[in-house]
Interface confidence: low
């Protein structure tokens, strides 16, 4: 069981300082953008991260949203990431969803943070090089020190 | 091949400090963390802290914080572990370890270990 | 802090016994669990993480088991090589805890 605390507005980059996005076919990427690009590209570049309350407590449990038109939501639904219109709900009855995933920092540096899915164990949202783009994806993690599912979460409000 | 090689044995005196060096190679130094363990005599491992490279900042575990500090340079693939005010129960192996920083944060590297001991 | 029990502390066996050790957490931890050999005088080995996966050059006949709070090493045919200390770590929390430690000794 999740229940919805507070939210909070956040801008997520990758460990090469990339910003992520969500462009006009609503795909989460990595750009390379100054300060003054991340704010021209407002809402797409702000995302909405809301913070549950968890009945197991296994981490901060997280939804990841942003606002263009409307509200659409992060979900790893068969371990591919989209974003679906809709809002984050302000309960969860279950165990496992496919839009929680578990916020962790690493020690010493809060900012610096991996988010693991709630349905799938051991599968944590990354950057991926595909062709010139730079996705979001889910990707198991069986390797020690990659770098590719750590991220900075700088707080807008 | 990683390689984890640590600094020679010390003999301290109660009161002092202690620094004990971890040299890597073989491998990426920046993107793991480097943990302290160490083992008194006929004891078990104890966590004692750990440090990434690429971010910098160290964290301890409770027991030794303000006691223990944890460096890292990646120019030359080295970690440090020192550790003041030191007393006889103090006295052990010190080994530093190779681990991870993502969901998983196993050590899959040693050192050789450094015996540090501390008496009058 | 996580505190994690390993029993029995000490075993006495044979060659060609099947031992098992037991490494309870204090609550839940999924399979953030590691296993690890000691021998006197050296650094400990990783044999097993996440649980159950083995590390790679490590005799099949050692396993990983169990999730949540309760886990299990199995060694399914005692070697003499594997007369040494046996230690578990959770890693849930990014503050690493390891068990007391299992000594396996030639019955």
């Known amino acids: 069981y999740f229940g919805k605390l507070e939210s909070k507005l956040s801008v997520i980059r990758n460990l090469n300082d990339q910003v992520l996005f969500i462009d006009q076919g609503n795909r989460p990427l990595f750009e390379d953008m100054t300060d003054s690009d991340c704010r021209d590209n407002a809402p797409r570049t702000i995302f909405i991260i809301s913070m549950y309350k968890d009945s197991q407590p296994r981490g901060m449990a997280v939804t990841i949203s942003v606002k263009c038109e409307k509200i659409s939501t992060l979900s790893c639904e068969n371990k591919i990431i989209s974003f679906k219109e809709m809002n984050p709900p302000d309960n969860i009855k279950d165990t496992k969803s496919d839009i929680i995933f578990f916020q962790r920092s690493v020690p010493g540096h809060d900012n610096k943070m991996q988010f693991e899915s709630s349905s799938y164990e051991g599968y944590f949202l990354a950057c991926e090089k595909e062709r010139d783009l730079f996705k979001l994806i889910l990707k198991k993690e069986d390797e020690l020190g990659d770098r590719s599912i750590m991220f900075t979460v700088q707080n807008e409000d | 091949q990683v390689q984890l090689v640590q600094s020679g044995a010390e003999v301290k005196k109660p009161g002092s400090s202690v620094k004990v060096s971890c040299k890597a190679s073989?491998?990426?130094?920046?993107?793991?963390?480097i943990s302290w363990v160490r083992q008194a005599p006929g004891q078990g491992l104890e966590w004692m802290g750990g440090?990434?490279?690429?971010?910098?900042?160290?964290n301890y575990a409770q027991k030794f914080q303000g006691r223990v500090t944890i460096t890292a340079d990646e120019s030359t693939s080295t970690a440090y572990m020192e550790l003041s005010s030191l007393r006889s129960e103090d006295t052990a192996v010190y080994y530093c370890a190779r681990g991870g920083y993502g969901g998983y944060y196993y050590f899959d590297y040693w050192g050789q270990g450094t015996l540090v001991t501390v008496s009058s | 802090d996580i505190q994690m029990t390993q029993s029995p502390s000490s075993l006495s066996a044979s060659v060609g016994d099947r031992v098992t050790i037991t490494c309870r957490a204090s609550q839940s931890i999924s399979n953030r669990l590691n296993w690890y050999q000691q021998k006197p005088g050296k650094a400990p080995k990783l044999l097993i993480y996440?649980?159950?996966t083995l590390q790679s050059g490590v005799p099949s006949r050692f396993s990983g088991s169990g999730s949540g709070t309760d886990f299990t090493l199995t060694i399914s045919s005692l070697q003499p090589e594997d007369f040494a200390t046996y230690y578990c770590q959770q890693h849930y929390q990014w503050l690493t805890t390891f068990g007391q430690g299992t000594k396996v000794e030639i019955k």
């Open positions: 073989g491998g990426t130094f920046s993107t793991f963390s």
């Open positions: 440090i990434i490279p690429i971010f910098g900042t160290a």
């Open positions: 996440k649980g159950s």
